[in-house]
């Protein structure tokens, strides 16, 4: 049975060309964590961070992705197009698979704050 | 340009052990992971796990884990691993291969060790 | 286990030919998939990863493609030399799997 909770930054907004933290945490588990996989909103993989072997960024975002902190990841010189959902998903044993979903907004404007807190999606 | 050379082919008994080996050359050893890889004749692949060589951390398939160890020795660039219990199912191609820096897909082979279990 | 089904065990082609293997996953497996060439008695060979990039060295006639669950890798003119078994992998989820292969043959 099921018993985790993914808590998420939830929803967050960051300023363009700067840098923001995408951050999930599983609590209420003993489950085992053997991977950690981040995705974009089209499905593209970020990266994967597996718990014995470390952590692999994908092609697509290696100049503009770095792993942690913790099993997070930080997604920096953003732009426009980086808007949407991310999912962090959890591949627990025994457990199963746990998902969490955090919403990105990159704002123009220069006044922009960064804004995140953690929620229970 | 990098290689991947394995140990030569074994012939064991059924409950034995065997031990392979496989040493890198032409890259970084700790930089990318190892992993091992089974190939029954004419079968698919199949992966038995892989390994860190930087911290030692291993992820196995749990089809292998109570059986096989892997291990590495840095200073001579070389990966192990080692199965156990064998019977006439482990008889196969063993690969050592290595990852890729982008993700878990596998750049590099090396030959193949040939292990045939048989009393 | 996440299981990669390849349909076809083998196909059949003739030199020139656009020919395409796909790979169904039993789970979402994102953009983790690879493409690996193996031909007899060789060991396997890197060609696509992440599923659309091309490896060091593998010619442009190569393709891949896909997400999700379902994947293509092309030969958009095949060679004498693309004889061999072609096998997809997954590594969005361990155990890291792969299909069964699909055995190219020249007609």
């Known amino acids: 049975m099921m018993t985790g909770t993914i808590e998420t930054t939830g929803n967050i907004s960051a300023k363009k060309g700067g840098s923001v933290i995408l951050q999930c945490h599983l609590s209420s588990t003993m489950a085992q964590v053997t991977q950690v996989n981040w995705e974009q909103h089209d499905h593209s993989l970020l990266a994967i961070r597996n718990a014995e072997l470390g952590w692999h960024i994908y092609p697509a975002f290696k100049d503009r992705v770095a792993p942690g902190p913790g099993l997070g990841l930080t997604l920096q010189s953003l732009t426009m197009n980086d808007t949407g959902e991310y999912f962090c998903t959890y591949h627990t044993y025994p457990d199963g698979t746990y998902r969490g979903r955090i919403f990105l907004e990159v704002l123009e404007s220069s006044v922009a704050e960064h804004s995140a807190r953690f929620q229970i999606p | 340009e990098v290689q991947l050379q394995q140990s030569g082919p074994e012939l064991v008994k059924p409950g034995a052990s065997v031990k392979i080996s496989c040493k890198t050359s032409?890259?970084?050893?700790?930089?990318?992971?190892m992993h091992w890889v089974k190939q029954s004749h004419g079968k698919s692949l199949e992966w038995i796990g892989g390994?860190?060589?930087?911290?030692?951390?291993?992820s196995y398939n749990q089809r292998f884990k109570d059986r096989a160890t892997l291990t590495v020795d840095k200073s001579s660039s070389t990966a192990y691993m080692e199965l156990r219990s064998l019977t006439s199912e482990d008889s196969a191609v063993y690969y050592c291969?290595?990852?890729?820096?982008?993700?878990?897909?596998?750049?590099?082979w090396g030959q193949g060790t040939l292990v045939t279990v048989s009393a | 286990d996440i299981v990669m089904t390849q349909s076809h065990k083998f196909m059949s082609t003739s030199v020139g030919d656009r020919v395409s293997i796909t790979c169904k996953a039993s789970?979402?497996?994102?953009?983790?998939v690879a493409w690996y060439q193996q031909k007899p008695g060789q060991s396997p060979k890197l060609l696509i990863y992440?599923?659309?990039y091309r490896y060091t060295g593998v010619p442009d006639r190569f393709t891949g493609s896909g997400s999700g669950t379902d994947f293509t890798f092309t030969i958009s003119s095949v060679q004498a030399e693309d004889l061999a078994v072609y096998y997809c992998?997954?590594?969005?989820?361990?155990?890291?799997?792969f299909g069964g292969g699909t055995k190219l043959e020249i007609k």
């Open positions: 291969t290595r990852g890729t820096y982008y993700d878990y897909s596998f750049a590099y």
């Open positions: 032409g890259s970084t050893f700790t930089e990318y992971t």
């Open positions: 390994l860190n060589p930087n911290n030692g951390g291993t």
């Open positions: 789970h979402y497996v994102s953009t983790a």
């Open positions: 992440s599923p659309s």
């Open positions: 992998h997954q590594h969005y989820s361990t155990p890291w799997t």
